[in-house]
């Protein structure tokens, strides 16, 4: 069966939107009005992995781009990157581990934990216009809570 996907945008708990910053990086900033069109639309695919009521494994692709968020070690540190893939073969039900995030719902907020690096989360900075990154702390200065807005296909 084909992998189930939905289109969505994400905003952090401070209502910052995610936009492209160069070809392989996302940044978070406040957008208003027509600028909202700049925010990236994700194709969120529901993939194979350990699942529970509040934890669902997903892959986060950029809609109509052959780019996926992936988590790899760089200089021995878990790092978030945008990785190009062959669009003929992705998304697939069994994604490589670096592409998988555990989507965790807590109090109507979403966290995205790396399946590859437990307790590391997609994060944004308090500051404006900073890169989206993989962070190893929750409840500190950095933001790990998001809301999801559905986008029609």
């Amino acid at each position: 069966a084909p992998v189930r996907s939905l289109n969505c945008t994400l905003r952090d708990s401070q209502q910052k939107s995610l936009v492209m910053s160069g070809p392989y990086e996302l940044k978070a900033l406040h957008l208003q009005g027509q600028d909202m069109e700049q925010q990236v639309v994700f194709s969120m695919s529901f993939v194979q992995g350990e699942e529970s009521n509040d934890k669902i494994p997903v892959a986060l692709g950029l809609k109509e781009k052959n780019l996926y968020l992936s988590c790899v070690l760089k200089d021995d540190k878990p790092t978030l990157q945008l990785e190009s893939v062959d669009p003929k073969n992705y998304p697939k039900k069994k994604m490589e581990k670096r592409f998988v995030f555990n989507k965790i719902e807590i109090n109507n907020k979403l966290e995205f934990e790396s399946a590859q690096f437990p307790n590391w989360y997609i994060s944004t900075s308090q500051a404006e216009n900073m890169p989206v990154f993989l962070g190893g702390t929750k409840g500190g200065q950095d933001i790990t809570d998001f809301t999801m807005q559905f986008v029609s296909s």
Epitope: G49, L73, E83, E96, K97, R98, A115, F117, P118
Partner: antibody, heavy 120, light 107 residues
């Protein structure tokens, strides 16, 4: 240091199930990121990846052999077991286990291999 | 699956020679390319990972380069212990696949 050693029958009959064990030391499959793969090499030929298991029991299989393969781990014994059903003479090969950690890591340590012949 | 085409399948060289082996995946593997050495009766050894990074303990005469769909393993000055079979492998996409191997023999 890291070592891996494969064990299993040298000879199996066609249609039988092969069970191979990889016993390792120098690392733990309870450590986040760790994984072990099985890879085989028919006589005089190249290498073919079969299956991989991660510390969290996440499993990956070669699509062409998925229906015949099962990979499991016993963390307390430092072992990974591969079973392969419905063996055929074309499955005659040396079977290796190798360590591979965080995706997309390479196989950084390999066992010596165990030779399996499929014949009646 | 990503096919890995390795060339040449064998080569003859002398001690001190510079040797180059090529690996061409069937699609872009974004540098997720590894090289291994196999000697009879010995365990396979990882030489190079992520295209150009030397695994610990591997002599600096081994080097790797490339991008996209074109990768190279170079031995700058062949030593007697380097006569062996070399394999490339991609870790971009499951199923992880290997090249057919290059046997380096004494001329």
């Amino acid at each position: 240091q890291v070592t891996l050693k494969e064990s299993g029958p040298a000879l199996v009959k066609p249609t039988q199930t092969l069970t191979l064990t990889c016993t390792f030391s120098g690392f733990s499959l309870s450590t986040s990121g760790m994984g072990v793969s099985w890879i085989r090499q028919p006589p005089g030929k190249g290498l073919e990846w079969l299956a991989h298991i991660y510390w969290d029991d996440d499993k990956y299989y070669s699509p062409s052999l998925k229906s015949r393969l099962t990979i499991t781990k016993d963390t307390s014994k430092n072992q990974v077991v591969l079973t392969m059903t419905n063996m055929d003479p074309v499955d005659t090969a040396t079977y290796y286990c190798a360590r591979g950690s965080y995706d997309p890591s390479p196989f950084d340590y390999w066992g010596q291999g165990t030779t399996v012949t499929v014949s009646s | 699956d990503i096919q890995m085409t390795q060339s040449p399948s064998s080569l003859s060289a002398s001690v001190g020679d510079r040797v180059t082996i090529t690996c061409r995946p069937s699609r872009d593997i974004t540098n997720y390319l590894n090289w291994y050495q196999q000697k009879p009766g010995k365990t396979l050894k990882l030489l190079i990972y992520h295209t150009s990074r030397l695994h610990s303990g591997v002599p600096s005469r081994f080097s790797g380069s490339g991008s996209g769909t074109d990768y190279t393993l170079t031995i700058s000055s062949l030593q007697p212990e380097d006569f062996a079979t070399y394999f490339c492998q991609q870790s971009k996409s499951v199923p992880w696949t290997f090249g057919g191997g290059t046997k380096v023999e004494i001329k």
